[in-house]
Each structure stands twice: as C-alpha cells, then as structure tokens.
Interface confidence: medium
C-alpha cells in the first residue's frame, strides 16, 4: 500500500468548488507533517501551490490565488486542497506530498523532477 493515496481523477463544473483528498497511510501521523500541493499542466513542470500544517502555520506559493486553499483532517489522516471558483485553466494534475515542518523552505522552493518522490500521489482534474 502506498504511503499516500489520491483518487486518480475528479471533475466538477466551472465556477464550483472542488476538494482534492490526500490520505496518509495509517502507520504515519498526518498531525506531524506539512501537506504540500503542486499543480502540473500538460507539457509544463510542476509548480508549488501551497503548504499546510495548520491554520496558523501555512504558506501560499507566489502568485497562487487565494481560491486555492489547504486544510487537514487529523482524525482521518487526510490533507485537502480546495479550489473554489473552478476555472478552465485549473484543469491539471495535482500532486500532494508530505514534509516535515522544519524543511518548509527547502521543500517549497524547488520544482519537482520528472520522477516524483515516493511519498507523492496525484489527482487529475479534467
């Protein structure tokens, strides 16, 4: 069983809100991790969207609009990415990853390589 799990695809109507789920395997505690979200459009490198540890400890990627937001459900061991006012350009692959709080700056300051880290999962928003 992979460390992280995301549904392979999700869709919603334009203008609505969609919530992507990233579930961490039960032998890990999401409470101690920051959840990182990346977006990748076809033919483009991934870009960092946001990092979420808690409401008081989170960061948005540069120029990422506030309609992208993160949250966590510690009881269910899940991280969430909500995209409100869904737009055509939001059609993309979304990757979640877990990282320690302390490595926030290094984690979010790099684009990912073609081979995603083992702790990465993805959801396509068609």
């Amino acid at each position: 069983q992979p460390v992280l799990h995301q549904p392979p695809a999700m869709s919603s109507a334009l203008g609505t809100t969609i919530r992507l789920t990233c579930t961490l395997r039960n032998d890990h505690d999401i409470g101690v991790y920051s959840v990182y979200w990346y977006q990748q459009r076809p033919g483009h490198p991934p870009r960092f969207l946001l990092r979420y540890f808690s409401q008081s400890d989170k960061s948005q990627g540069p120029q990422v609009p506030p309609r992208f937001s993160g949250s966590k459900d510690v009881a269910r061991n899940r991280g969430y990415l909500s995209i409100s006012e869904l737009q055509p350009e939001d059609e993309a692959m979304y990757y979640c990853a877990m990282g320690a709080r302390s490595s926030e700056k290094e984690e979010r300051e790099r684009e990912w390589e073609e081979e995603m880290e083992p702790t990465a999962a993805r959801t396509r928003v068609p």
């Epitope: 076809p42 033919g43 483009h44 490198p45 870009r47 960092f48 990627g61 540069p62 120029q63 990422v64 737009q87 055509p88 350009e89 300051e109 790099r110 684009e111 990912w112 390589e113 073609e114 081979e115």
Partner: antibody
Framework: EVQLVESGGGLVKPGGSLRLSCAAS????????MSWVRQAPGKGLEWVAY????????YYADSVKGRFTISRDNAKNSLYLQMNSLRAEDTAVYYC?????????????WGQGTLVTVSS | DIQLTQSPSFLSASVGDRVTITCRAS??????LAWYQQKPGKAPKLLIY???TLQSGVPSRFSGSGSGTEFTLTISSLQPEDFATYYC?????????FGGGTKVEIK
C-alpha cells in the same frame, strides 16, 4: 540584488560551435527555472530554450532543436547554452532570463545579453 | 505553436495620452500572458504577468486585461520614459512565443 551576466558570445563561422554561459547571483539559483531568449538585430524576441531547476524538464524552440543544448550547474550558479551547427539566422543577442517561480515561463529578471554573430 | 499578433506595430503618441496595445492569440491561452517593455540596447523588463497582474515596482499607469485569445496593455497617461517597444508573450504551452512587438514613438 539579482544579477545575470552572460558571456561567451562572439564571431563564428557557419557550421561552427559556441558555448554561452550565464553567471547568476543574488538569489537561490537552484530553485528557479531558467531560459535563453534571443533577439536578432532590429527584430523581436524569440524564446530559445528552458530548463527547470533540477534539469528534469527541458524544452527547445523548433528552430534550435537538435543543434542547441541547455544545461546548468547549480553548484556554480551557472546556466549554459551549447550551440552547434550554427547558421546565419542564429545571429542575435542572447539573453539569459530567470523564470518566475510560479510558472517558469515568464521572466522577471534578464541579463544584459551577449552578441553571437554567425558569418563567413 | 501558438502565434501572437500584436497591433499596432507602430504607435505615435504624446505625453499624457492613453495608449492601448492589443495582443491576439491563435488559440485560447486563458490568462497565461505576460507583457514586457524594452528600450533600445537594453534587456526587456516584465510589466504584467497572468494577463492583468502588475509586476512589483511597475507604475500603476500600466494595466493589463483579457483572457482567452484577446488581451490588452493600457498605459493610462503616457510618460516620457514609456517610449519603448512592448511585447506580449504566452506561457500557456511550449514552445513559448512572443508577439511581434509594438513600438511607441513620440508624436
């Protein structure tokens, strides 16, 4: 202060080779995608090549594909463009440009440019 | 490849004029468009990204609008330092492409 300084331009004969370098300073080079953009004398801008921060994603303009190679050395804060089989139409000022962190595809900092002249 | 067509190619205007430059894309690019200003012998300077977001340090007299295939760059009140060539650029897909440029000259 962000600085990008190109070097390596000059006069070369058709069919020849040249290697351009771009020395970056004032920012964490290893976290940014970089591009080369060129401008022929009296003409507009033409994007040439892109490389992401870890070299895992590389793209080229059709006009240079198979002849030019973009690379980088993050330890040296340097970007390179190896140009082979040069043609007269490659004559241009070559700019090194930093991709915006959020997209990589638009450029918030540019070097001063280095002139490449291909002529017999 | 996505083609960008800028109009006009040349524009004569006076200080204080309101100037509008148009950029049309050959296919829809949402808001993946940037605008640059270039002065003779200098490197381009980013003015606007994401079609309408002003780059830090750029005067507020510059504004961008549009989405899909039609975009505009507006200078609300032309200043002496604004006489330059302006380029649009799409980053919707690779290869990245630029418009042909619009040269703004003193009338």
């Amino acid at each position: 202060e962000v600085q990008l300084v190109e070097s390596g331009g000059g006069l070369v004969k058709p069919g020849g080779s040249l290697r351009l370098s771009c020395a970056a300073s004032g920012f964490t080079f290893s976290t940014y995608g970089m591009s080369w953009v060129r401008q022929a004398p009296g003409k507009g801008l033409e994007w040439v090549a892109y490389i992401n921060n870890g070299s895992g994603y590389i793209y080229y303009a059709d006009s240079v594909k198979g002849r030019f190679t973009i690379s980088r050395d993050n330890a040296k804060n340097s970007l390179y463009l190896q140009m082979n089989s040069l043609r007269a139409e490659d004559t241009a000022v070559y700019y090194c440009a930093r991709g915006q962190w959020w997209s990589g595809g638009d450029f918030d900092y540019w070097g001063q440019g280095t002139l490449v002249t291909v002529s017999s | 490849d996505i083609q960008l067509t800028q109009s006009p190619s040349f524009l004569s205007a006076s200080v204080g004029d309101r100037v509008t430059i148009t950029c049309r894309a050959s296919q829809g690019i949402n808001t993946w468009l940037a605008w640059y200003q270039q002065k003779p012998g200098k490197a381009p300077k980013l003015l606007i990204y994401a079609a309408s977001t002003l780059q830090s340090g750029v005067p507020s007299r510059f504004s961008g609008s549009g989405s899909g295939t039609e975009f505009t760059l507006t200078i609300s009140s032309l200043q002496p330092e604004d006489f330059a060539t302006y380029y649009c650029q799409q980053l919707n897909s690779y290869p990245l492409t630029f418009g042909g440029g619009t040269k703004v000259e003193i009338k």
